[in-house]
């Protein structure tokens, strides 16, 4: 019995279906086929879980979190024992193993390993202002998404004709901040933050209204 080499790792967007491949060759009929799919979750590496089981011509559910979401891609028994996982969750990220036994065929490699990474687009970021909006002050524009795998980068732009930030602005695309020093009336306006990663982008807006000092009455 020989389990074929797997592609190594698979990436899928959260909520989308994933297919984890596992095929094998055997010299024996598939009468006593026994397949166990296990996962070592990234979030809990010392707690392997059963995903799905095929034994004695019957299928059995694995861990409760997979119930109703997992199945074999083809009719069993077969030499293709790949599985699908529907509506993938972040917690599905991990290392998956298919363990195949088909008595009396013994020996050879009976385990296939595939990594699954569930990617998450940046969630709707929150935009906020830190600091006084009085003229001459320094302000920080903050932008952050609660979710995003890989970690999002952030790009700020000012929604005017140029889409350029004021000349006194410095941007940190990793932290999602823009520091604008010595704000003036020209700093006022609508700013947009674009959070992006490998599978998506999201945006939020922020209105910076620089406050000019009120003229004082001379008594």
């Amino acid at each position: 019995l020989e389990v074929s080499e797997s592609p190594g790792s698979i990436q899928v967007a959260r909520g989308q279906p994933a297919v984890l491949p596992c095929t094998f060759t055997t010299s024996a009929a598939l009468i006593n086929l026994n397949v166990i799919w296990m996962v070592t979750p990234l979030s809990n590496a010392n707690q392997p879980e059963q995903v799905i089981l095929y034994q004695g011509g019957q299928m059995f559910d694995g861990a409760p979190r997979f119930h109703g979401r997992v199945g074999f891609t083809g009719t069993m028994p077969a030499t293709n024992v790949s599985i699908f996982i529907n509506n993938t969750q972040l917690s599905d990220t991990g290392t998956y193993q298919c363990l195949v036994n088909n008595l009396p065929d013994i020996g050879g490699r009976n385990i296939g390993v595939t990594g699954l990474t569930v990617l998450v687009p940046p969630s709707a970021p929150h935009c906020q202002i830190q600091g006084s909006q009085d003229i001459g002050s320094d302000v920080i524009l903050l932008c952050s998404s609660e979710e995003g795998i890989p970690r999002p980068t952030y790009l700020w732009e000012k929604l005017d004709n140029t889409l350029k930030l004021p000349p006194t602005a410095t941007q940190d695309q990793v932290q999602g901040t823009v520091t604008i020093r010595n704000i003036s009336a020209l700093s006022s306006g609508l700013y947009q933050c674009v959070a992006s990663n490998a599978i998506g982008t999201s945006t939020c807006l922020l209105d910076l209204q620089v406050i000019s000092p009120q003229p004082r009455n001379i008594g």
Epitope: A13, R14, G15, P121, P122, S123, A124, P125, H126, C127, Q128, C143, E147, E157, L159, D160, L163, S188, G189, L190, Q192, C193, V194, G200, T201, S202, T203, C204, L205, L206, D207, Q209
Partner: antibody, heavy 121, light 112 residues
């Protein structure tokens, strides 16, 4: 009373321009962006753009770029939307709507009652 | 660029619950918040839900919003349906500088 009061219905010929007004009362006019949204008869809502009443800065939907002009007069708390080169497809009710930016996302919490603009030869 | 797609119409009896979906055509539904508006015949729209599920204080708690990642859609649920709920309902989101503010096509709710 917080409200937006719009100008009356207009009938225009193709190729002409129309200017719709929207007078704000009961709140600080310069404190909120004003948006314009239109609705053709029996159709859905279509966003046209915004104006910042404080600065006069504008942002227009690509579809209307070059044909729409949004202005304001802060002394009378009024926003204006002018649409030029009118065609029959521009027949619609035009709404002004106050824009709120909660945590970075537009929503419209106050609407005018709408101005019907009919384009007909 | 993405679109927001809503069912053209739904109908239900008074007292029952109705759910209206708003499906995003591309990109994740979680990437930009969704708002919901009610438009009664002959009137301007009014806000019902903002930021997916937040409800302005004047809106009855019979109206609720949610999102579902697997179907990439937002939903508006109206429970304890009343005849006064007969109206058009629109979802709305933001598509960045290229698209600006987007509205779904609207759903007509009929109370039987």
């Amino acid at each position: 009373q917080v409200q937006l009061v719009q100008s009356g219905a207009e009938v225009k010929k193709p190729g002409a321009s129309v200017k719709v007004s929207c007078k704000a009362s009961g709140y600080t006019f310069t404190g909120y962006y004003m948006h314009w949204v239109r609705q053709a008869p029996g159709q859905g809502l279509e966003w046209m753009g915004w104006i910042n009443p404080n600065s006069g800065n504008t942002g227009y939907a690509q579809k209307f770029q070059g044909r729409v002009t949004m202005t304001r007069n802060t002394s009378i708390s009024t926003a204006y939307m002018e649409l030029s080169s009118l065609r029959s497809e521009d027949t619609a009710v035009y709404y002004c709507a106050r824009g709120r930016l909660e945590r970075g996302y537009w929503y419209f919490d106050l609407w005018g009652r709408g101005t019907l603009v009919t384009v007909s030869s | 660029n993405f679109m927001l797609t809503q069912p053209h119409s739904v109908s239900e009896s008074p007292g029952r619950t109705v759910t209206i979906s708003c499906t995003r055509s591309s990109g994740s539904i979680t990437s930009n918040y969704v708002q919901w508006y009610q438009q009664r015949p002959g009137s301007a729209p009014t806000i019902l839900i903002y930021e997916d599920k937040e409800r302005p204080s004047e809106v009855p708690d019979r109206f609720s919003g949610s999102i579902d990642i697997s179907s990439n859609s937002a939903s508006l649920t109206i429970s304890g349906l009343k005849t006064e709920d007969e109206a058009d309902y629109y979802c709305q989101s933001y598509g960045g500088t290229s698209q600006g503010v987007l509205f779904g096509g609207g759903t007509k709710v009929t109370v039987l």
